[in-house]
Interface confidence: medium
Amino acid sequence: QEEDLPRPSISAEPGTVIPLGSHVTFVCRGPVGVQTFRLERESRSTYNDTEDVSQASPSESEARFRIDSVSEGNAGPYRCIYYKPPKWSEQSDYLELLVKETSGGPDSPDTEPGSSAGPTQRPSDNSHNEHAPASQGLKAEHLY
């Protein structure tokens, strides 16, 4: 029996509380060899795929999904999933994005510190060889 795929993790930079109009980047991480990362947005059942995958460390790969100007419509839960041939992984935990109106006060920070959900070294629900060529993947619906 081949090894289970580790679950992906998801984090947000610079954090999960973002002022209206500011940018946020979701970072999805998984093992080396990931071909496609998918960022899925729960509230609208939409997702965005990327094959722009980089190596974050000797044992990790990552993909970054940037929203240039956050609106109230971008608020909500997000999660990651990845395709490492020939299998898809389980989904990461949810990460909640909060959008706040800019107060402009000197005492209020623009963002919360970086936040993340889900370890990368837990097994996915993939104890068998699940055949899912990326070419079979559905066309991405854009998140923004």
Partner: antibody, heavy 114, light 113 residues
Framework: SSSVEESEGRLVTPGTPLTLTCTVS????????MGWVRQAPGEGLEWIGT??????TYYASWAKGRFTISKTSSTTVDLMMTSLTTEDTATYFC?????????WGPGTLVTISS | ELVMTQTPASVEAAVGGTVTIKCQAS??????LAWYQQKPGQPPKLLIY???ALASGVSSRFKGSGSGSDFTLTISDLECADAATYYC???????????????FGGGTEVEIK
Amino acid sequence: SSSVEESEGRLVTPGTPLTLTCTVSGFSLSSYTMGWVRQAPGEGLEWIGTTSNDGSTYYASWAKGRFTISKTSSTTVDLMMTSLTTEDTATYFCVRGTNIRSLWGPGTLVTISS
Amino acid sequence: ELVMTQTPASVEAAVGGTVTIKCQASQSIGSNLAWYQQKPGQPPKLLIYLASALASGVSSRFKGSGSGSDFTLTISDLECADAATYYCQCTYGSSNNNNYGDPFGGGTEVEIK
């Protein structure tokens, strides 16, 4: 290899509470969502609820209040059922996963009869 | 709560033929849909996950397609062993932010003649 198995089914009278136990092996419950599904004789599959790896639980609207799912150890997940009626007679399945539910128990028959 | 509507309830087809089963969600679920095959006295067997991904050990004669709220399972080159009941299921997974649940469709009984 990984496996899940439900405890032996029972014949109980209406109103009697009953707990089914799902015992897992070959993987850690701390990494997986586990769910319960049932199937009345000759009928279709019916989702009861799930407990996620972080311990959160979610239920079908009809199951809320009468059914409780909990991880009781590192290898067991319980389904506690109350106020049982003859309508709850079914085979109960334990299943692992969220988007990839390839691991099912064989099922256990629960009969509610007076 | 999400409702999955599966059609037809039953279908009869010849060996070598093709069967198409449809599943409609009452709201969009992205690609979070699974298809199962169940034979009497057995638990369901996963055929397709994430709408179009073929599960381990499953023949490529089974093909899943669709996204959003409309999904299809196509079984081609039918064999006698394909006689079974087929179910779709939303696999979105619940959270504090949704009440989708993970409901099943009503099932489609496939008879091979």
